[in-house]
């Protein structure tokens, strides 16, 4: 028997469910009474689904994940795992043996949107050209961590003095604070990008300083 | 040929500590967990500790947890096996085997003996 | 005390078919496939079924093994006297996350 899975990793949305495809080619006259089925998490070996004897077993993990059983006389062992979690990451093997046996891992990405950045400025009034000023960019409960970039009204790239933190929440997603330290000239535009370097998706906040007032 | 040679077996008195070594050969090494099992003298097959392939995840019977520590060297292809605070139950003979994708331990060393005795 | 239970002894005459029984839990043998494990005296284990019934290449086809809802079984036919030797029964536990051993049969041929 040969099990085929998708070799890209699978992206999955924070409270989302997704699918790990699984899939192997049943002989002729195969009945589901032959067929063993363990879905494992490759790291550690924890079972997360069996299915075994003609019996789904039912999930060892959470009680979030399914099979489709309609579909596994057809060949198709794929794993359901409901409302995922940032701690549900990493590599999950798929295992069937019927006659003989085989086996193949597929990787399960999770992935959440970073919320629009929110912009503070301090201070924030009796602002002059030549005074420092720190601008705070904070965007919110996205997964993985970002990537934070700063740029100035000409679209140049603001690098030096930029402290950016990242702190995980109970839930395992990142709240970012990037913080631009910057000498005002008499107007300017300032841009923080957050980048979620798995969905691609760019927020974007600014704030404009054209003496008084702010803009954000 | 695949083989697995283990070594560093010897007479410790009670209290005392010993580190055994399995020497690996004849396959990838750093892509399989590996276990340690052992065999006291009439007595049947007894599970130790297991290892993923990485070293990061570890794996105790009860038996052993929190006086032996698996470890292992990729770059030098062996496993370890740190015994310390060792009692007269712990003599026997260990065994180093792999681990593979299917849940199978199908190589298995030779053995070491270690005799706990006053 | 094993968490596996295999009976501690088996006879049989040169040609006769014993079985061996390793009885388990929905933890072990319910969920994950069985090994059975061959030990001549004085020597390290060797690989006799693997995966509840295959056979690695060397092993004769005199050994088969299945597996029903909690218990394996190994069935050795055509008994022959270099069949004596002490089996066992291994698979890993979920609960206790360990590899687990049966006690261990005794095949003596008479």
């Known amino acids: 028997v040969e099990v085929q899975v998708s070799e890209d990793p699978v992206v999955a949305l924070v409270d989302t469910d997704a699918t790990l495809r699984c899939s192997f080619s049943p002989e002729p006259g195969f009945s589901l009474a032959q067929l063993n089925l363990i879905w494992q998490l490759t790291d550690t070996k924890q079972l997360v689904h069996s299915f075994t004897e003609g019996r789904d077993q039912g999930s060892a993990y959470s009680n979030r994940t399914a099979l489709f059983p309609d579909l596994l006389v057809q060949g198709n062992a794929s794993l359901r795992l409901q409302r995922v979690r940032v701690t549900d990451e990493g590599s999950y093997t798929c295992f069937v043996s019927i006659q003989d046996f085989d086996s193949a891992a597929v990787s399960l990405q999770v992935a959440a949107p970073y919320s629009k950045p929110s912009m503070t400025l301090e201070p924030n009034k009796d602002l002059r050209p030549g005074n420092m000023v720190t601008i705070t960019c904070s965007s919110y409960q996205g997964y993985p961590e970002a990537e934070v970039f700063w740029k100035d009204g000409q679209g140049v790239p603001l690098t030096g003095n930029v402290t950016t933190s990242q702190m995980a929440n109970e839930r395992g997603l990142f709240d970012v604070h990037s913080v631009l330290r910057v000498v005002l000239g008499a107007n300017g535009t300032y841009s923080c990008l957050v980048r979620n370097p798995v969905l691609q998706q760019d927020a974007h906040g600014s704030v404009t300083i054209t003496g008084q007032p702010l803009t954000f | 040929e695949v083989q697995l040679l283990e070594s560093g077996g010897d007479l410790v008195q009670p209290g005392g500590s010993l580190r055994l070594s399995c020497a690996a050969s004849?396959?990838?090494?750093?892509?399989?967990?590996m276990n340690w099992v052992r065999q006291a003298p009439g007595k049947g097959l007894e599970w130790v500790a297991g290892?993923?392939?990485?070293?990061?995840?570890?794996y105790y019977a009860d038996s052993v947890k929190g006086r032996f520590t698996i470890s292992r060297d990729n770059s030098k292809n062996t496993l370890y096996l740190q015994m310390n605070s060792l009692r007269a139950e712990d003599t026997a003979v260990y065994y180093c085997?792999?681990?593979?994708?299917?849940?199978?331990?199908?190589?298995w060393g030779q053995g070491t003996t270690v005799t706990v005795s006053s | 005390q094993s968490v596996l239970t295999q009976p501690p002894s088996a006879s049989g005459t040169p040609g006769q078919t014993i079985t061996i029984s390793c009885s388990g839990s929905s933890s072990n043998v319910g969920r994950r496939t069985v090994n059975w494990y061959q030990q001549l005296p004085g020597t390290a284990p060797k690989l006799l079924i693997y995966t509840n019934a295959q056979r690695p290449s060397g092993v004769p086809d005199r050994f088969s093994g299945s597996k029903s809802g909690t218990s394996a079984s190994l069935a050795i036919s055509g008994l022959q006297s270099e069949d004596e030797a002490d089996y066992y029964c291994?698979?890993?536990?979920?609960?206790?996350?360990?590899?687990?051993f049966g006690g261990g049969t005794k095949l003596t041929v008479l």
């Open positions: 291994a698979t890993w536990d979920d609960s206790l996350n360990a590899w687990v």
């Open positions: 085997a792999d681990w593979n994708d299917y849940d199978i331990m199908d190589v």
């Open positions: 004849g396959f990838t090494f750093n892509t399989y967990w």
């Open positions: 290892i993923n392939s990485k070293g990061g995840v570890t």
